[in-house]
């Protein structure tokens, strides 16, 4: 299994993946396979009304660039000295022995997985293509026969099955074949989007590819600068009883998704008032309605808030309210 995979994003469309070779490979590593797929946003983002008081906006950050080759080790340090440098405690004899045992176990387990869990598949041609993966058959553990090697306990393996696993949509993920290096720049990704990346080490190229168990890592691309800006005009219509209907277009390709809109409006000479329009409300109304406005000239600005933060305010839109109707709510049905 490739070791210590780390992923970072250096732009809104790229993720850099780095890893270390397996510690005890079965033969020579000829190449690595990297697969990636978009991850859906958390379901709670669709459920919660982020306009409700006390509800914090969801925090989503992209994967920051590497500080240094060993930046990931920072979290594992035993302590920090006054200069902020990190040092590990010296290893005891028992720790060294334990690591040797783990290394030996890992090799045995990888041999088992290699020979039993995976059926070899023919080499895929090309790079960066859609992966048809017709001949690679990943058996479920439920298909594995009785074994004598030391492996983590899995209850009652039934007899080995010779039936092939049906093709699933997962088998059409984009992938890249990496030769002679332990890094890859994945390009052409969607901005501010989470990706699940699968990394495999392979020790045979032709005629049949033999690859390790996958190592997984997740990363999110960086936000796109103007993706959360509302494009086009904010339009309005004044209905009877001075109900003002404001309408705008949602950003076409936001950073993640839009969770709310802020509507900022003010009557000439008064202070600004703010209104929050939830994702759900906007989906039904395609805007919002203002009621109970005192007569006068008004200006309105709107901005969207996505998983990455706020977009820009729109240019002000102006309208004139002629008379006053005392309606308690500012946002109408």
């Amino acid at each position: 299994v490739p070791l210590d995979p780390i992923s970072v994003s250096n732009s809104s469309s790229q993720i850099i993946l780095k890893w270390k070779p397996p510690s005890d490979p079965n033969g020579n590593i000829t190449h690595y396979l990297v697969f990636w797929e978009r991850q859906a946003e958390d379901s709670e983002l669709f459920e919660l009304d982020y306009c409700l008081k006390g509800l914090k906006l969801p925090s989503r950050t992209w994967s920051p660039p590497f500080e240094s080759e060993d930046s990931q080790k920072h979290n594992q340090s035993e302590y920090e000295d006054s200069a902020g440098e990190c040092c590990s405690c010296p290893k005891t004899d028992s720790q060294i022995l334990k690591e040797l045992e783990e290394s030996s176990f890992r090799k045995t387990f990888e041999d088992y997985l290699h020979n039993v869990v995976f059926v070899p598949r023919k080499t895929s041609s090309g790079t960066g293509a859609e992966d048809p993966r017709p001949s690679r058959k990943r058996r479920s553990l439920g298909d594995v026969g009785n074994v004598t090697v030391a492996v983590p306990t899995v209850a009652a393996f039934p007899n080995t099955s010779s039936t092939s696993v049906p093709t699933s949509p997962e088998e059409h993920r984009p992938f890249e074949k990496v030769v002679n290096k332990e890094s890859l720049v994945i390009s052409g990704l969607r901005h501010f989007t989470g990706y699940r990346i699968e990394l495999q080490a392979c020790n045979q190229d032709t005629p049949e590819e033999r690859c390790s168990v996958a190592a997984y890592v997740s990363a999110r691309t960086m936000p796109e600068a103007k993706a959360d800006d509302i494009v086009g005009p904010v339009t309005h219509e004044i209905f009877e009883n001075n109900v003002v209907h404001l309408m705008w277009q949602e950003p076409k390709e936001p950073n993640g998704l839009i969770v709310l809109y802020e509507v900022s409006y003010r009557r000439y000479g008064d202070e600004e008032l703010h209104l929050c329009v939830s994702r759900k409300h906007f989906a039904l109304e395609r805007g919002c309605r203002l009621r109970g406005l005192s007569p006068g000239n008004y200006s309105v600005r709107i901005r969207a808030t996505s998983l990455a933060g706020n977009g820009s305010w729109t240019e002000p839109t102006y309208f004139y309210v002629t008379d006053y109707l005392d309606v308690p709510s500012n946002i109408a049905k």
Partner: antibody
Framework: QMQLVQSGAEVKKPGESLKISCKGS????????IGWVRQMPGKGLEWMGI????????RYSPSFQGQVTISADRSISTAYLQWSSLKASDTAMYYC????????????WGQGTLVTVSS | SSELTQNPAVSVALGQTVRITCQGD??????ASWYQQKPGQAPLLVMY???SRPSGIPDRFSGSRSGNTASLTITGAQAEDEADYYC???????????FGGGTQLTVL
């Protein structure tokens, strides 16, 4: 492209239960309201209700409140219309439609599901 | 009232202009949408908001609103415009929607 695909025609007896479906694709199903519309033979369109799959918030027309149940499963991008006890008067074409374009406006429609209730 | 009233039937000579109307108190505070339905087909959105057409809808279709009446106008009616037309808006409560009874348009 944007699509709503409804389940096939149904023939039922009075008193039976039924659940018809509408599968959305090509858009964010969870964050778009979806509704149901009835059209009885030779008659006009009747607005039944709408649901927001994101949190299953549902709004029924007073005429259909308690008569049907609208639900959605966002994990499979599917909305449902359900009856616990059908009547002959439920015989109709039922359309699902997505609220899009503008407020409360159905911009995309399913092909319709014909429900026939007869003894 | 939360009802929307339409003329049951209207006819127009080929190439002429026809106006289909929809009346209801709620139209004083809400936009109307218009749908075209041909026999055996699902309805099709042809007009929404003040005067907005979805892509693919010919520009001979236009919309307007005055007081409690919304109108759909077809300027230079074509044979393929022969269909039932339904208006749709919110009811007066604002919590539900409602369709008009429909207008059958015949192109002579």
């Amino acid at each position: 492209q944007m699509q709503l695909v409804q389940s096939g025609a149904e023939v039922k007896k009075p008193g039976e239960s039924l659940k018809i479906s509408c599968k959305g694709s090509g858009y964010s199903f969870s964050s778009s309201w979806i509704g149901w519309v009835r059209q009885m033979p030779g008659k006009g369109l009747e607005w039944m209700g709408i649901i927001y799959p994101g949190d299953s918030d549902t709004r029924y027309s007073p005429s259909f409140q308690g008569q049907v149940t609208i639900s959605a499963d966002r994990s499979i991008s599917t909305a449902y219309l359900q009856w616990s006890s059908l009547k002959a008067s439920d015989t109709a074409m039922y359309y699902c439609a997505r609220v899009g374009a503008s407020g409360w406006t159905f911009d995309y429609w399913g092909q319709g599901t014909l429900v026939t209730v007869s003894s | 009232s939360s009802e929307l009233t339409q003329n049951p039937a209207v006819s127009v000579a080929l190439g002429q202009t026809v106006r289909i109307t929809c009346q209801g108190d709620s139209l004083r505070n809400y936009y109307a949408s218009w749908y075209q339905q041909k026999p055996g087909q699902a309805p099709l959105l042809v007009m929404y908001d003040r005067n907005s057409r979805p892509s693919g809808i010919p520009d001979r279709f236009s919309g307007s609103r005055s007081g409690n009446t919304a109108s759909l106008t077809i300027t230079g009616a074509q044979a393929e415009d022969e269909a039932d037309y339904y208006c749709n808006s919110r009811d007066s409560s604002g919590n539900h929607a409602v369709f008009g009874g429909g207008t059958q348009l015949t192109v002579l």
